[in-house]
């Protein structure tokens, strides 16, 4: 997260860290007791490493009573996701067992109504991604408040030049932005999961390159079918 600040500890109990060989790779969001939603491209970077999900964490390194690392029973990328595009950049991870729920571990309701979030709406994005262009990685969860950007502006030639589909949404990126390591994390508006940070190698913090988020409402049928 660029231009953000440390989050209040455990105030986002849905927040997950998708880890490979014990290292944070991507963000994720608990959407059901045994399921974490993340970004499909995160798996590409996992290679043959052991994928696990950390729940109940604020600090990645410090001991916390609510922290627990779960093995992944099954990884389900969206069937139409491709390495060369950010389309359908969603991944569902089934935990090896149901998460132990508590004040620091709770699923987040996700948007099912397939309607665009009003441009200008301030939404919360959080993650353990880099906090500087130099690549400094935080130990504690960071967050930032970002205004939703209308799709037409986001699709301008000077911005994302038509790449933003109806199944994506954008948020402003003027110095405040999600960045590398935040992919797969939640964009929360009005207490509901609206978007998932896409995992392209986009430049961060440049207002001409807004943050791109996969709209979960557009994938309600797929999410339901996997969770069923």
């Amino acid at each position: 997260i660029l231009g953000g600040r440390e989050a209040e500890a455990h105030a986002r109990p849905y927040m997950a860290s998708v880890q490979v060989n014990g290292e944070h790779l991507c963000g994720g969001v608990l959407v059901a007791e045994q399921w974490v939603l993340s970004a499909a491209h995160c798996l590409e970077d996992a290679a043959d490493g052991k994928v696990q999900v950390l729940l109940g964490a604020h600090s990645l390194s410090q001991p916390e009573p609510s922290k627990r690392l779960y093995d992944v029973l099954r990884a389900v990328p969206h069937p139409d996701s491709r390495p060369d595009t950010i389309d359908h950049d969603l991944l569902l991870l089934q935990l090896s067992e149901k998460a132990t729920l508590g004040p620091a571990v709770r699923p987040l309701p996700w948007q099912r109504v397939d309607r665009d979030v009003e441009p200008g709406t301030l939404c919360d994005v959080a993650g353990w991604g880099i906090v500087s262009h130099a690549g400094r990685r935080p130990d504690r969860l960071q967050h930032v408040l970002l205004p939703v950007l209308d799709r037409a502006t986001c699709n301008r030639r000077t911005h994302h030049d038509g790449a933003i589909t109806q199944r994506m949404m954008c948020a402003e990126s003027n110095r405040r932005d999600s960045c590398k390591g935040d992919s797969g994390g939640p964009l929360v508006c009005g207490g509901v999961l609206e978007g998932v940070v896409t995992s392209g190698s986009r430049v961060c913090g440049n207002r001409k390159k807004p943050g791109i988020y996969t709209r979960v409402a557009s994938y309600a049928a797929w999410i339901d079918s996997v969770l069923a």
Epitope: R5, E8, A9, A11, R12, Y14, Q62, P63, E64, P65, G102, P103, L108, L122, C123, D124, H143, L145, P186, V188, C189, G190, G191, V192
Partner: antibody
């Protein structure tokens, strides 16, 4: 300095609803959750729930889940709690409170709700 | 939920006296990973909001007089006032933040 200013006392009829407010100042409103605590006359403290004003996420004590609705207005740095289907059991002082780390370091002055026919 | 039990429910004291009050939790509030007890104490004077006194079971909040001391570990905790002043007459609550937030029923400190 951190201040939490709560709305005035409310007198309500059984079955009615009330909505109280808690205006925050002295810090960035969206950086901290706002919690609500109930205190019946001469009784102890009960945690109701919280709202994270940044994304609007809420979490409730199961006991109060159907009774209360927590909202927040980022533009005015104000948190709200609505109590519905009021009964005499809801007559109490309601506090908004902000944590520092894990404990409540900052409290509003309380809003007294009296439910009476 | 973790249940917090405070005793006694009320306590009549004289100014200058040493006072101890107890708080017991239904499960341990000590986290072995950091050796911290997830417990706080608050003071509430009549007609006022609660005020934080102690956190991590024994760390005094800034500005709180050193006559207030928190001690204990696991499930048994104590708040001690070494020499009571008239201004200390209040209700004292313990509060656990290990899991869903719960408070004790309070100990009322009254003048003899």
């Amino acid at each position: 300095q951190v201040q939490l200013q709560q709305s005035a006392a409310e007198l309500a009829r059984p079955g009615a609803s009330v909505k109280m407010s808690c205006k925050a100042s002295g810090y960035t409103f969206t950086d901290y959750t706002m919690h609500w605590v109930k205190q019946r006359p001469g009784q102890g403290l009960e945690w109701i729930g919280y709202i994270n004003p940044s994304g609007g996420y809420t979490d409730y004590n199961q006991k109060f889940k159907d009774k209360t609705a927590l909202t927040a207005d980022k533009s005015s740095s104000t948190a709200y709690m609505q109590l519905s289907s009021l009964t005499s059991e809801d007559s109490a002082v309601y506090y908004c409170a902000r944590r520092r780390d894990y404990w409540f370091a900052y409290w509003g002055q309380g809003t007294l709700v009296t439910v009476s026919a | 939920d973790i249940v917090m039990s405070q005793s006694p429910s009320s306590l009549a004291v004289s100014v200058g006296e040493k006072v101890t009050m107890s708080c017991k939790s239904s499960q341990s509030l000590l986290y072995s990973g950091n050796q911290k007890n997830y417990l706080a104490w608050y003071q509430q004077k009549p007609g006022q909001s609660p005020k934080l006194l102690i956190y991590w079971a024994s760390t005094r909040e800034s500005g709180v007089p050193d006559r207030f001391t928190g001690s204990g570990s696991g499930t048994d905790f104590t708040l001690t006032i070494s020499s009571v002043k008239a201004e200390d007459l209040a209700v004292y609550y313990c509060h656990q933040y290990y899991s869903y937030l719960t408070f004790g029923a309070g100990t009322k400190l009254e003048l003899k």
